[in-house]
């Protein structure tokens, strides 16, 4: 059977949602003495990247600018040690907004509920789209999808203080192609107060796992490395 | 204080339609969605629809989607429904309510088809 | 489409009497459960929201509370004025659904 290295991370830096005309940078990362890095657009090759030196750094970061419609869609990378290949790395969807309108967000009851109620966000948009998206702030890879003619429903809940912070909607003309995104509705979740300490509030930075992490390798990783092998050997 | 002012009565013919008011007063209109509610004589309570003034999201029951049209004039902080169509089932009072919870109410219109 | 059937239609008691009137949901409603009054004259007046928070202004012999799928309104010690109609309301999922009423009658 042929021989290949461990799949790469595909990652999208800040964010997978990127306004239409501004940069894209997609993060490939493989591992210390790649040579070449390949980014491919729904199968096809679209760029390559060459570290320098390839030995002393585990990936590479790809720009894409004047990000448009037929720029969006499913991205992979693979990269290549020697003349061994790697596995492809898993798919990443890469998204454009500020496409046409900007569509309303409006939460039932009410922005202010208490934990236990059942709560359900209504997206309006009224040009032609049939999609529409929900997204809590810090937390958008968890999209909710609902479909309608010019809005959509969101039902949630019964809800508890997990479910706090602000949520924003989208109208999508194709699953890569996204509206402006509407004013954010911050839902306000109260009672629930042996949990209230343990909800994690929302943070206002990007995902988490929306961050490069490329680093590139310097004489202390190779010491720490030996200490760390020496000890491991010592604690045998 | 949180008001919502309906007219008393209107009386309307069988098949012509009526638009029903609601005058709201005393809280940020824009901010807090506005129901409508069925009641026939002697029966009980019926959810007809709701609006959010802040960007005309609407919905409806089922049953209520070709009878009623629910509007808003947020320069004047009112909120409106048209019955069309009206046959004597229509003849009941309706009140609007307001904020997700229905947490006010108004007086209710008594909409009377008769010929 | 939520049912909500509520108990009893009817009901007499005293003065001072303690009653309880019961809705059940046909499908979970979390806490979003009302409890309206409706006077004689039409008016109509919210006394709890989210099953158990009562309104301002209303009296604290009004109480809401829930067991699994029964939400219940009990009165501890029934006034003159409170022998009107009592109506509940869920407001979970729409089409948003009321319970058939109570008619509260004195003996």
């Known amino acids: 059977p042929k021989q290949t290295l461990p799949k790469p991370i595909i990652r999208a830096e800040s964010t997978y949602m990127v306004p239409k005309e501004k940069q894209a940078t997609l993060c490939c990362q493989g591992s210390y003495g790649a040579v070449e890095y390949q980014l491919h657009f729904e199968g096809s090759l679209f760029a390559v990247e060459r570290p320098k030196p390839p030995e002393r750094i585990n990936g590479v970061k790809f720009h894409i600018p004047d990000m448009n419609s037929r720029k969006a869609g499913r991205y992979s990378c693979i990269y290549r040690v020697g003349e061994l290949w790697s596995e492809r790395s898993d798919l990443l969807d890469l998204v454009v907004t500020e496409m046409y309108d900007t569509p309303t967000l409006s939460v039932h009851p009410g922005p202010e509920v208490t934990s236990g109620e059942k709560v359900t966000f209504y997206c309006r948009l009224d040009t032609a789209t049939s999609m529409f998206l929900l997204l809590k702030e810090g937390r958008s890879r968890d999209v909710q999808r609902s479909y309608g003619k010019v809005q959509a429903e969101f039902p949630m809940g019964p809800v508890t203080t997990a479910h706090r912070g602000s949520y924003r909607c989208f109208g999508s003309y194709n699953n890569y192609a996204w509206s402006f995104p509407s004013e954010p509705v911050k839902l306000l979740v109260t009672g629930d107060i042996e949990n209230t300490s343990l909800a994690p509030t929302d943070p206002t930075f990007p995902d988490s796992w929306d961050t490069c992490l490329l680093t590139r390798e310097t004489g202390l990783q190779k010491d720490l490395a030996l200490w760390d092998h020496t000890a491991q050997n010592l604690l045998r | 204080q949180v008001q919502l002012q309906q007219p008393g009565s209107e009386l309307v013919r069988p098949g012509a339609s009526v638009k029903l008011s609601c005058k709201a007063s005393g809280y940020t209109f824009t901010s807090y969605w506005m129901h409508w509610v069925k009641q026939r004589p002697g029966q009980g309570l019926e959810w007809i629809g709701t609006i959010y003034p802040g960007s005309d999201i609407t919905n409806y029951d089922e049953k209520f989607k070709n009878k009623a049209t629910l509007t808003v004039d947020t320069s004047s902080s009112t909120a409106y429904m048209q019955l069309s169509s009206l046959t004597s089932e229509d003849s009941a009072v309706y009140y609007c309510?307001?904020?997700?919870?229905?947490?006010?109410w108004g007086q209710g219109t008594l909409v009377t088809v008769s010929a | 489409e939520i049912q909500m059937t509520q108990s009893p239609s009817s009901l007499s008691a005293s003065l001072g009497e303690r009653v309880s009137l019961t809705c059940r949901a046909s499908q979970d409603i979390g806490s979003s459960l009302n409890w309206l009054q409706q006077e004689p004259d039409g008016t109509i007046k919210r006394l709890i929201y989210?099953?158990?928070s009562l309104d301002s202004g209303v009296p604290k012999r009004f109480s809401g509370s829930r067991s699994g799928s029964d939400y219940s309104l009990t009165i501890s010690s029934l006034e003159s004025e409170d022998f009107v109609d009592y109506y509940c309301?869920?407001?979970?999922?729409?089409?948003?659904?009321f319970g058939g009423g109570t008619k509260l009658e004195i003996k």
């Open positions: 989210a099953t158990s």
């Open positions: 309510t307001r904020d997700g919870r229905f947490a006010n």
């Open positions: 309301l869920q407001y979970a999922s729409s089409p948003y659904t």
